[in-house]
Amino acid sequence: KAMHVAQPAVVLANSRGTASFVCEYASPGKATEVRVTVLRQADSQVTEVCAATYMMGNELTFLDDSICTGTSSGNQVNLTIQGLRAMDTGLYICKVELMYPPPYYMGIGNGTQIYVIDPEPCPDSDF
C-alpha cells in the first residue's frame, strides 16, 4: 500500500525569494501524527531543507531558525520557503511520514522545481 504524495511540478519564487507550494498525500490510514520534510535534490545529492512533525488538526511547527513555514488542512500541507536566492534554484521534494498510529507509512513526492531569480539591483538615480 504505497502512499501517494502530490506536489506541483514547477513554482517560481517571488521577488523577495519566497516560494509556496502545496504537498498533498493520500493517507492509507487514519494518521494522527505526521512528519513533513522538505528535501532538496541537486546533482543526485539530497539534503534536508526543513522538517516538522504535527498533530492532525494542529499547526505545523518548524524550528525557530527554519526557512520554512506551513499550515495543514486535512491531507494537505501548504509549505512556504523563504530567503531563497538564485543559487537555491532546484528540485524540492516533499516527504510525508505517518508516524502514529501504526503502521508507519512513508510517501515521497516527485519534487517541485523551484526557480529563483535574484532581483536586479536598483540603479543609482540622479536627483
Epitope: A2, M3, P28, Y100, P103, Y104, Y105, M106, G107
Partner: antibody, heavy 118, light 108 residues
C-alpha cells in the same frame, strides 16, 4: 565519512539479556531515523525495528515486540538494542542501519554476531 | 505485511554476461519504495538502487533497476568478477520493512 561502528560479538545463554550498540560518526545523528536488522541462515534479512530521529517514535517487528527495546542517545551519537529473554532462534548477525532521506538503508554497521546457546 | 519474493534463488552466469534478477511484492509498493542491496560473504549489505531505478552514490552504471507496482527487476548488464554476490530487494514504504530471500549470483 559516514561510519556506523557496532559493539563486539556476544555469547549468551537462553533467557539472558544483552545490549548491543552502534556508534555513528560523519553525519548529524539527531536528524536520522535508525533501524536494527538481523540476518540468520534460517530467516534471511529480518527487520527488527526503528527509532525516529528524536526517539519519540519506535516500531518493532511482531517477532520481537515486547522482548527487544531500541533506544538512542543523540548526545553520544549512539544507538542501542536491548534483547531480553533470549532464545536460540535469536542467534544471528545484528546490523544497525541509517534511513536515507529517500527511504532505504543507505549506510549499515559492520554487524554484531549474537550467539544464544546453552 | 508485504511479502517480497525473489527469483531465481541462484543464478549462474559467466563474466561479461547479462544478469536479470526478479522481485515480486505481494501487494503494490510503488516504484518510489523499492530498493536493491548487494551483499558479499561476511559483509553488511550495500545499497545499490533506491526508488526502483535510481543508483546509489558510487554504483556503476552497469547496474540498473526497473519496474513498478508489484514487479521489479535488477539488471547487471555485463557481470564483473566483483559482482558475484547475493542481491536482496526490499520495500521501504510502510512498516514492517521487508526483504526478499535473496538471489545468489555465482560464476558459471
Amino acid at each position: 565519512e559516514v561510519q556506523l561502528v557496532q559493539s563486539g560479538a556476544e555469547v549468551k545463554k537462553p533467557g539472558a539479556t544483552v545490549k548491543i550498540s552502534c556508534k555513528v560518526s560523519g553525519f548529524t545523528f539527531s536528524h536520522y531515523t535508525m533501524h536494527w536488522i538481523r540476518q540468520s541462515p534460517s530467516r534471511g534479512l529480518e527487520w527488527l525495528g526503528f527509532i525516529s530521529y528524536d526517539g519519540n517514535y519506535k516500531y518493532y517487528a511482531d517477532s520481537v515486540k515486547g522482548r527487544f527495546t531500541i533506544s538512542r542517545d543523540n548526545a553520544k551519537n549512539s544507538l542501542y538494542l536491548q534483547m531480553n529473554s533470549l532464545r536460540a532462534e535469536d542467534t544471528a548477525v545484528y546490523y544497525c542501519a541509517r534511513t536515507g532521506w529517500l527511504g532505504p538503508f543507505d549506510y549499515w554497521g559492520q554487524g554484531t554476531l549474537v550467539t544464544v546457546s546453552s | 505485511e508485504i511479502v517480497m519474493t525473489q527469483s531465481p534463488a541462484t543464478l549462474s552466469v559467466s563474466p561479461g554476461e547479462r544478469a536479470t534478477l526478479s522481485c515480486r511484492a505481494s501487494q503494490s509498493v510503488g516504484s518510489s519504495y523499492l530498493a536493491w542491496y548487494q551483499q558479499k560473504p561476511g559483509k553488511a549489505p550495500k545499497l545499490l538502487i533506491y526508488g526502483a531505478f535510481s543508483r546509489a552514490t558510487g554504483v556503476p552504471s552497469r547496474f540498473s533497476g526497473s519496474g513498478s507496482g508489484t514487479d521489479f527487476t535488477l539488471t547487471i548488464s555485463s557481470l564483473q568478477p566483483e559482482d558475484f554476490a547475493t542481491y536482496y530487494c526490499q520495500q521501504d514504504g510502510s512498516s514492517p520493512w521487508t526483504f526478499g530471500q535473496g538471489t545468489k549470483v555465482e560464476i558459471k
